[in-house]
């Protein structure tokens, strides 16, 4: 089995490599993954307490 | 259902091996890197390798390069760790976890979403 | 090695209570950072990741915050369940690595 680079930091690694649409680069790993999407519901009502949280959609298999 | 389930651990001496087992079911374990962490008695949470069985990329803690061995089976759906030279710091409760990722801008962002129930591994005379 | 140093290590603190954890990394790791929360004798359990988004099925009242070396976990209104540890950990570079931990008891 082959390791990813250990000593690679962000700043010096190379750029991300292109992924297919349903990949997207991660940086741990140094390689693409699957990837699901991220959405930002609309902002609340003005007068609510706090900004709706951020959350995501699960990856598809 | 996404579920994790290790097996495998028990009693060794120092200097003995076991061998990890992370059977995995409701995704495949070639679309993400699967980790394994453990946890000492009483202590946090430590990190110890992590595979991407897609392409066979593994990365270890210094603690344990040299010793241990992470692998993955894509037809199995299953990752190892295989644990040589055993020491009584090596005792923990070991995790095995997925790690799932969102796309930012192209990037991962992502954390371990599944775990699995942790089995204990005790290294004792 | 990218450290995460997290503060306090422990905390008292009762139901309804604002409760602020904070991480600090030893280096840039612009927003990857993720939070858990571990119960005794339990897996862990992914709250936030990417900083500030929150995990699917995580209680609203759990937040995150930061970017660059310092990051947050907020808990708006601490309910009976939240009583637990906390961990955060960087994802940035291999190897990732765990703060220390903050376990939260009832006061």
């Known amino acids: 089995m082959r390791r990813g680079p250990r000593s690679l930091r962000g700043r010096d690694a190379p750029a991300p490599t292109p992924c297919v649409p349903a990949e997207c680069f991660d940086l741990l790993v140094r390689h693409c993954v699957a990837c699901g999407l991220l959405r930002t519901p609309r902002p609340k009502p003005a007068g609510a307490s706090s900004p709706a949280p951020r959350t995501a959609l699960q990856p598809q298999e | 259902e996404v579920q994790l389930v290790e097996s495998g651990g028990g009693l060794v001496q120092p200097g003995g091996s076991l061998r990890l087992s992370c059977a995995a079911s409701?995704?495949?374990?070639?679309?993400?890197?699967i980790h394994w962490v453990r946890q000492a008695p009483g202590k946090g949470l430590e990190w110890v390798a992590w595979?991407?069985?897609?392409?066979?990329?593994?990365d270890y803690a210094d603690s344990v390069k040299g010793r241990f061995t992470i692998s993955a089976d894509t037809s199995k759906n299953t990752a190892y760790l295989q644990m040589n030279s055993l020491r009584a710091e090596d005792t923990a409760v070991y995790y095995c976890?997925?790690?799932?990722?969102?796309?930012?801008?192209?990037?991962?962002?992502?954390?371990?979403?599944?775990w699995g129930q942790g089995t204990l591994v005790t290294v004792s005379s | 090695d990218i450290q995460m140093t997290q503060s306090p290590s422990s905390l008292s603190a009762s139901v309804g209570d604002r409760v602020t954890i904070t991480c600090r990394a030893s280096?840039?790791?612009?927003?990857?950072v993720a939070w858990y929360q571990q119960k005794p004798g339990k897996a862990p359990k992914l709250l936030i990741f990417?900083?500030?988004y929150l995990f699917s099925g995580v209680p609203s009242r759990f937040s995150g915050s930061g970017s660059g070396t310092d990051f947050t976990l907020t808990i708006s209104s601490l309910q009976p369940e939240d009583f637990a540890t906390y961990y955060c950990?960087?994802?940035?570079?291999?190897?990732?690595?765990f703060g220390q931990g903050t376990k939260v008891e009832i006061k």
């Open positions: 990417a900083a500030s």
């Open positions: 280096e840039d790791i612009s927003s990857a």
């Open positions: 976890a997925r790690r799932v990722c969102y796309n930012r801008l192209g990037v991962c962002a992502g954390g371990m979403d599944y």
């Open positions: 595979v991407l069985p897609s392409v066979g990329f593994t």
């Open positions: 950990q960087q994802s940035q570079v291999s190897p990732p690595t």
């Open positions: 409701g995704f495949t374990i070639s679309s993400s890197s």
